[in-house]
Structure formats: structure tokens, C-alpha cells
Interface confidence: low
């Protein structure tokens, strides 16, 4: 008698390894014999597809060499024209040993930046990824994290992060190791010990000492009053990435001596500078034909702004230059109490360095004006609104005295540091923080962003320097 098809062995979930054989069985009882068709993810499997073998009148489906793309739901449908067609479905789960599809590569990075070592994996079950540094498992912390993708992310890279890394992908079927890669951390040149200033008698010997570090180890050069040191002997030694340089001098004139530490990162250089003054006792007394003389700053208002032991120009057109210039700053300083927190530190730096200009010692002591670019940075980036208000008040004669006019430089009349980098002074201490800078327009309009204004800079690696460093 005719009998509608019945599937006596429903399909089950089949686990298979890549490149192995996987078989689904769909046993059917019926009369007459049914036609059996197979689908994968609802798409018909063609009888002539060479990746499959269909036997036993269609009751056995064999995948001859499983690929990871064979994952899915397989269904058999039996129909013999008696009653309705019947269907049974089962899943194929392709199991796969871990495989690293995007291994890490060697990375060279500057200290403080973010490093990402890729490690993308495949496998089923999904492999867990861990990392080995040297011979030990790498521990995650607030800086070091293994991302969901398996990549290793290191925030604020430190010197101690340098070393050999490899990633390990593991699941129940096995383990895969990447090749060993190298993370190299480079460090900007930094001065550890700055040369000290000396007040000596004519004809003395003085040794200036400068120590610097960085990766690669920096080189040290000495500059005398803006030029390469012409006399004196230099002794250098290097130990544990620290370079030590000693400049021995026979003193016949005052001078400003700058130690410059430089190292290379790819095609670019980083530079750190520190300066010391050599003054000669009884040398810098005001002479009749001089407009001023060099002396160490001894006031209070600009203490935090001017470099420690800064040599400043005191103008002898005042009866008491130190007191008169200090009063000038003090008067202008009081007016800064009302300006924005972005503008204030920048304006203070500008004021102090304009009124107490850096002094170049010599037979005729010379004041060194502020570089135009730094003045413009304060004017246009930090204090744009305040500057406009101040200029307006000046034109309308709203200030109590003319004194403030001396305290605000006219940027366009200052020398540019592109004419002669030694003819003008950089402003140290333009300290600012990101939070205060939300008033600045974003650099572009394509995506919203807030950027610290990038002030014109020389080749030195930082705009803000420690008080012991000179930026000349």
C-alpha cells in the first residue's frame, strides 16, 4: 500500500574539524521510494556539486572536506507524492584549531604615545588570546589591555615596555603562537643635570657640567652666546644611556653657555637645552655709553615665570632700574587678575619677558627681545579677546597711566625667530591645560574637535620648559 514518507532518524547536530569528513543521515520509510533533496541554509545542494557525496538513495549526505564556511543548518526533505513532504534539519558546527590571521609586527614608538600590536585569530570555539613578553605571561593593567580583537594596546608607552612580544591563541582543540616581535621604545632627549652659572674673576678656569639621557643616547653640543663654542676643551662619557659632557673654559669675558642634547627619531630630532651664565666680578657695571646692564633677576613678581637665575637687562634710563621695572610689571600684573585662565599664564610670561628682557652679556650688554611668533601666539591664540579689549582701551585713553604701554609689546615690531634664532627670546612657561582651551575654534570643520593651539616652535621638543632651562 502507498505510504507517506516518515523520517525515522531525524538529523542531529554534527561537529566536524576543518578538512575532515562530515555526514548527515536522513533515514526515510515510505512507499513508493521518495525523492530526497538537501539544503544548506535554505539553499539547495546540487547533486553534481563535487564537494558533497549523496548516497543511499539520498539518505546520506557527506561533506568530503569540511571548510570553515560550511557552518550552517542542513535539511533533508523527502517527498513521494503520497501525503505531504517531510523535513528534518540539523546543524553543522565546524570546529577549528586556533589560527593567527593577522600576526603582530615589529613596532618602534616614542615614549608616551600609544602602541597597538595586532593579533587577529580564527577558530571554533573562539580562541582566547593572551600575550607573552620575554618568557613570561603579560599581565594587563590600567595601561596594558588585550582588546576584544586580540590586539595588545599599550597606552602611554614606557621604557620598560620595550622587549619581545608574542601572542598566543588557545581553544579546546589546540594552541597557536605568533612569531616573536620587538617593541622598541624611543625617548626624547632630556637634560638630567643642567650646567650651573658662575660668577668668577677674570682669567679663572671653570668647568661646566651637563648630563642628558634619551633613547637613542643623545649627543651634546655646547653653544657660547649663540655660536658654537670656539675655545675650551670638552670631555664626554656615556654610561647606561646617560651622556655626561664637561666643558672646561678659561674665562676672559662673560657669556651665556647653552648645553644642547639632541637625539634622532627616524628623520626627526628632539632637543633639550639648558643654559648657564658666566659673569665676571666687577664686569657689568653701568658705563656712561651703555643703556643698561645685565644682572640676575632678584624681584618677586616674575619669580615663577623667569628662568631660575635668569640674566635680565636692567635699563639705566631709570634711576633705580630694578625697582622701576618691578613696579611696571606689578602695575600691569594687577590688570591681569580679570583675564581668562587660558590667557593669564601666557600674558604673565609675555609681560615678564618683555619688561625683564633676557640679557646678552658682553662689552655692551644687549637686551634680547621676545620672538615675534611667541608674542603672536599669546596675542592670537591665548589672549585674542583680551588683547582686543586692551587695544581699544588704549585708543580711548581709559588707562590711568602710560606705564602699561611699556608692558605690552607690539608683536609686529619684534624680530622673527626665522631671521636669526639667536636674536630673539622664546617664552618659557606658556603652560595651559586642555580643559581651559574649549574656547578655541576647532582646527577644521569636518568633524568636531578641540585642539590645543600649536604654537610656533623651534626644534626643541616642548614649548613649556622647566625654570632651569633656557629656550635661547
Amino acid at each position: 500500500l502507498p505510504k507517506a514518507p516518515v523520517i525515522t532518524t531525524p538529523l542531529e547536530t554534527v561537529d566536524a574539524l576543518v578538512e575532515e569528513v562530515a555526514t548527515f543521515m536522513c533515514a526515510v520509510e515510505s512507499y513508493p521510494q521518495p525523492e530526497i533533496s538537501w539544503t544548506r541554509n535554505k539553499i539547495l545542494i546540487k547533486l553534481f556539486d563535487t564537494r558533497y557525496s549523496i548516497r543511499e538513495n539520498g539518505q546520506l549526505l557527506t561533506i568530503l572536506s569540511v571548510e570553515d564556511s560550511d557552518d550552517g543548518i542542513y535539511c533533508c526533505t523527502a517527498n513521494n507524492g503520497v501525503g505531504g513532504a517531510v523535513e528534518s534539519c540539523g546543524a553543522l558546527q565546524v570546529k577549528m584549531k586556533p589560527k593567527i590571521t593577522r600576526p603582530p609586527i615589529n613596532v618602534k614608538i616614542i615614549e608616551g604615545l600609544k602602541a597597538v600590536l595586532p593579533c587577529t585569530t580564527m577558530g571554533n570555539p573562539k580562541p582566547s588570546v593572551s600575550w607573552i613578553k620575554g618568557d613570561s605571561p603579560l599581565r594587563e593593567n590600567s595601561r596594558i589591555a588585550v582588546l576584544e580583537s586580540g590586539s595588545l594596546r599599550i597606552h602611554n608607552v614606557q621604557k620598560e615596555d620595550a622587549g619581545q612580544y608574542r601572542c598566543v591563541a588557545k581553544n579546546s582543540l589546540g594552541t597557536a603562537y605568533s612569531k616573536v616581535v620587538k617593541l622598541e621604545v624611543e625617548v626624547f632627549a632630556r637634560i638630567l643635570r643642567a650646567p650651573e652659572s658662575h660668577n668668577v674673576t677674570f682669567g679663572s678656569f671653570v668647568t661646566l657640567h651637563c648630563t642628558a639621557t634619551g633613547i637613542p643616547v643623545p649627543t651634546i653640543t655646547w653653544i657660547e652666546n649663540g655660536n658654537a663654542v670656539s675655545s675650551g676643551s670638552i670631555q664626554e662619557s656615556v654610561k647606561d644611556r646617560v651622556i655626561d659632557s664637561r666643558l672646561q673654559l678659561f674665562i676672559t669675558k662673560p657669556g651665556l653657555y647653552t648645553c644642547i642634547a639632541t637625539n634622532k627619531h627616524g628623520e626627526k630630532f628632539s632637543t633639550a637645552k639648558a643654559a648657564a651664565t658666566i659673569s665676571i666680578a666687577e664686569w657689568s657695571k653701568p658705563q656712561k655709553d651703555n643703556k643698561g646692564y645685565c644682572a640676575q633677576y632678584r624681584g618677586e613678581v616674575c619669580n615663577a615665570v623667569l628662568a631660575k637665575d635668569a640674566l635680565v637687562f636692567l635699563n639705566t634710563s631709570y634711576a633705580d632700574p630694578e625697582e622701576a621695572q618691578e613696579l611696571l610689571v606689578h602695575t600691569a600684573w594687577n590688570e591681569l587678575k580679570v583675564v581668562s585662565p587660558v590667557c593669564r599664564p601666557a600674558a604673565e610670561a609675555l609681560l615678564c619677558n618683555h619688561i625683564f628682557q633676557e640679557c646678552s652679556p658682553g662689552v655692551v650688554p644687549t637686551p634680547i627681545p621676545i620672538c615675534r611668533e611667541y608674542c603672536l601666539a599669546v596675542k592670537e591664540l591665548f589672549c585674542a579677546k583680551e588683547w582686543l579689549v586692551m587695544e581699544e582701551k588704549t585708543h580711548r585713553g581709559l588707562y590711568r597711566s602710560e606705564m602699561h604701554l611699556l608692558s605690552v609689546p607690539e608683536c609686529s615690531k619684534l624680530p622673527s625667530m626665522h631671521w636669526d634664532p639667536t636674536a630673539c627670546a622664546r617664552l618659557p612657561h606658556l603652560d595651559y591645560n586642555k580643559e581651559n582651551l574649549k574656547t578655541f575654534p576647532p582646527m577644521t570643520s569636518s568633524k568636531p574637535s578641540v585642539d590645543i593651539p600649536n604654537l610656533p616652535s623651534s626644534s626643541s621638543s616642548s614649548f613649556s620648559v622647566s625654570p632651569t632651562y633656557s629656550m635661547t
Epitope: K108, S445, P453, S457
Partner: antibody
């Protein structure tokens, strides 16, 4: 020695697609920003797209937004520019260039290394 | 978008001349401005980065400066190998803009 080599240029019909490759050596794509810049015959330089793969950030010129996709495969140390819906005005020599550091730093470094360029011609 | 207007578009000069090329930004920008030299059939070469820093290996006769939104490339004494096209380029965080170029030709 740092080197960038572009490939994948050629003749394509308007509306067609092309994928340019930029194979880098002497530095790692993951620690730099990669940029595509094009130059139409007899014209100036025009920035097309940039990628900073350490941050996964990308950006595009308005003229190619939605049609071009920049990507990088750090395992191959290669950057790509997938160009779809090509127009006659996309005809140019396409250069890939690099700048050191991520998006926030690289602007100050300049595009210090460039490839030799690959010509893309869109014509029926 | 920020536009970089470069002038002049071309100039004729003799060997030894001082040449100045200017780029004006349409709005206030940072100092992330670079200058490039390009010769026919060749890729551009970086000359100046960060508005005024000389890229290593570039002769010191090239210099860059900034005044407000004006950026200047100066060639102090033009040499035979300097006849080329020069481009300025401004980098924002999400956008790069080139000037239209200045062709420096032999007078």
C-alpha cells in the same frame, strides 16, 4: 630605508571600481598615518583620504566621501584605497604618502615619504 | 572648510634671486603647515614642516615663516635645481588642504 610603492591603477569605465594598494617598507603602517593624495593631469595636489591605523581613524575629502574607502592591513604593512562609483573627474595620478605618528601628531610632521604614484584613468 | 590661497600661481626668476611664495589660510589655523617641492613626473618632496622647521637634508636656503594666517616659503638664493612647483599644505585633525601651487620658472 623607507619606501612606499603604489599599485592597482589602470583604465576603468565611469561607475566602475578599482582598488589601489600602497605597500610600505622600512617603517610600520600601524605607527604612522597614511594618506592618499591625487593629482589630475596638469593640475595641483588634492588630498583624498587619511588613515591612522593605531587609532582606527579615517577621514575623507568631501569629493570622495561615500565612494572611496581607505583601509590598512598592518600584517601586510599595506594601505588600500577602494574606489567605487568612479567618475571622469577622478582621473589622476594617485600618490600614497606617510606622516609619522597618529592623527593628532602627524600634521606637524609633514608628509615626509611619498610613493612614485599610480595612474587611474576613468573613461568610457 | 579651510582654504589655502597660494600666491603667486607662477613666477619667473633668475638663479641667485630671492623667491617668496605665500599661502593665506581662510581662517585661523595652527602651525601644522608644510611646504613641498614637485618636479614634473615626480612625487612631491617635503621641505618645511610645522610652518618653519627645515626637514633634514633640505638646503638651508629654504625657510618657512608664519604671520597670522599668512605662511611664507622663502628661497634665499634660487639655484638651477630649484625650478619646480611648490605647494603649501595645512593639516587639521580631520582634514588636509593643499594650496593651488606656485610654478617657479627660469626668466
Amino acid at each position: 630605508e623607507v619606501q612606499l610603492v603604489e599599485s592597482g591603477g589602470g583604465l576603468v569605465q565611469p561607475g566602475g571600481s578599482l582598488r589601489l594598494s600602497c605597500a610600505a617598507s622600512g617603517f610600520t603602517v600601524s605607527s604612522s598615518s597614511i594618506h592618499w593624495v591625487r593629482q589630475a593631469p596638469g593640475k595641483g595636489l588634492e588630498w583624498v583620504a587619511s588613515i591612522s591605523s593605531s587609532y582606527g581613524s579615517t577621514s575623507y575629502a568631501d569629493s570622495v566621501k561615500g565612494r572611496f574607502t581607505i583601509s590598512a592591513d598592518t600584517s601586510k604593512n599595506t594601505a588600500y584605497l577602494q574606489m567605487n562609483s568612479l567618475r571622469a573627474e577622478d582621473t589622476a595620478v594617485y600618490y600614497c604618502a606617510r606622516s609619522e605618528g597618529d592623527r593628532y601628531v602627524s600634521g606637524y610632521m609633514g608628509l615626509d615619504y611619498w610613493g612614485q604614484g599610480t595612474l587611474v584613468t576613468v573613461s568610457s | 572648510d579651510i582654504q589655502m590661497t597660494q600666491s603667486p600661481s607662477s613666477l619667473s626668476a633668475s638663479v641667485g634671486d630671492r623667491v617668496t611664495i605665500t599661502c593665506r589660510a581662510s581662517q585661523s589655523v595652527s602651525s601644522a603647515v608644510a611646504w613641498y617641492q614637485q618636479k614634473p613626473g615626480k612625487a612631491p618632496k617635503l621641505l618645511i614642516y610645522s610652518a618653519s622647521s627645515l626637514y633634514s637634508g633640505v638646503p638651508s636656503r629654504f625657510s618657512g615663516s608664519r604671520s597670522g594666517t599668512d605662511f611664507t616659503l622663502t628661497i634665499s638664493s634660487l639655484q638651477p635645481e630649484d625650478f619646480a612647483t611648490y605647494y603649501c599644505q595645512q593639516s587639521g585633525v580631520w582634514l588636509i588642504t593643499f594650496g593651488q601651487g606656485t610654478k617657479v620658472e627660469i626668466k
